[in-house]
């Protein structure tokens, strides 16, 4: 069964996939595709890397992490409902039937309709001070407790830091990492 990830229409979706290169710079080809992982390759390929670089990508699909260190997590920009479905991450480890493959299910929810804030102070007061990160298992909610007033840029930065550090570690700890060599 597929691990499920969620995003809202208009957001960027994040689908995690990692491996540990045998040595720094000793990369393994990776492909991402729309549709469950078939026996070979990645269904309809949206992005791929080779031993050196990202060598094929389509619009809105990119790698935000350091793929040279094995973070081949996929970011899908500005998602729509049509982006819902299963995605395949395939680590194409050379050898006899060595590939590792992961099916990730992306669920896109309609965007929440919220009234436009009249003043920055009102927005800050109404902000729920809560961020959700998606790990390898059920979604975890991180409550940020009592915070000073923060603006959208700070929220975005905080979310990125939370995702990049905490989530990456959680994912690696939960067995979503493939070690090579």
């Amino acid at each position: 069964s597929e691990v499920e990830y969620r995003a809202e229409v208009g957001q960027n979706a994040y689908l995690p996939c990692f491996y540990t290169p045998a040595a720094p710079g000793n990369l393994v080809p990776v492909c991402w595709g729309k549709g469950a992982c078939p026996v070979f390759e990645c269904g309809n390929v949206v992005l791929r890397t080779d031993e050196r670089d990202v060598n094929y990508w389509t619009s809105r699909y990119w790698l935000n992490g350091d793929f040279r260190k094995g973070d081949v997590s996929l970011t899908i920009e500005n998602v729509t409902l049509a982006d819902s479905g299963i995605y395949c991450c395939r680590i194409q480890i050379p050898g006899i039937m060595n590939d590792e493959k992961f099916n990730l299910k992306l669920v896109i929810k309609p965007a929440k309709v919220t009234p436009a804030p009249t003043r920055q102070r009102d927005f800050t007061a109404a902000f729920p001070r809560m961020l959700t990160t998606r790990g390898h298992g059920p979604a975890e909610t991180q409550t940020l407790g009592s915070l000073p007033d923060i603006n959208l840029t700070q929220i975005s930065t905080l979310a990125n830091e939370l995702r990049d550090s905490r989530l990456a570690n959680d994912l690696r700890d939960s067995g979503a990492t493939i070690r090579i060599g």
Partner: antibody, heavy 122, light 107 residues
Framework: EVQLVESGGGLVQPGGSLRLSCAAS????????MAWVRQAPGKGLEWVAN????????YYLDSLKSRFTISRDNAKNSLYLQMNSLRAEDTAVYYC???????????????WGQGTLVTVSS | DIQMTQSPSSLSASVGDRVTITCRAS??????LAWYQQKPGKAPQLLVY???TLAEGVPSRFSGSGSGTDFTLTISSLQPEDFATYYC?????????FGQGTKLEIK
Amino acid sequence: EVQLVESGGGLVQPGGSLRLSCAASGFTFSDYYMAWVRQAPGKGLEWVANINYDGSSTYYLDSLKSRFTISRDNAKNSLYLQMNSLRAEDTAVYYCARDVGYYGGNYGFAYWGQGTLVTVSS
Amino acid sequence: DIQMTQSPSSLSASVGDRVTITCRASDNIYSYLAWYQQKPGKAPQLLVYNAKTLAEGVPSRFSGSGSGTDFTLTISSLQPEDFATYYCQQHYGSPLTFGQGTKLEIK
């Protein structure tokens, strides 16, 4: 026009070896996975092995992987199947087939060679 | 291994008939299914891939449908050249596996 032409089949004794070749033309050979599929006389189709674009990854029917080796030479647009320790049950027509391409999408053996007959008998 | 079971094993029909062949996978293969036609002494020919996409040059009287575990190949109006053996094949799990074949004969 896509063409796949197999060669190397013939009569071989049990325990013997044979190397099949498949010459490809009419497409960019290095952009496709390639496969061998066999068909015993009067029987159905059986997948034997696949190889990725550059030959770095190979895939086999479990019961054959200790005796058969698939390989390719992209410079020569050629696919090979080395068959060792042959048995009577390996008697079949062996087909070379073009599989999925670099961008995925089309999952099926789109083109086949005419086949080469391998007969294992004493 | 994923088992592919075709039915019927053989079928007698007449020119102009509508014919349906079914293929059942022992596990979910999504839409990674292909159909082939084979005539005696010839190599198989791809008819349909990804369960429902018609291969290049295949007449429109052939169509494929289904996903998951149950699939069908339909010939809307049988022509004399359609009498042959038909195979389904999955491209989802290793090893790749074929159905046992359906022999379509003239009634």
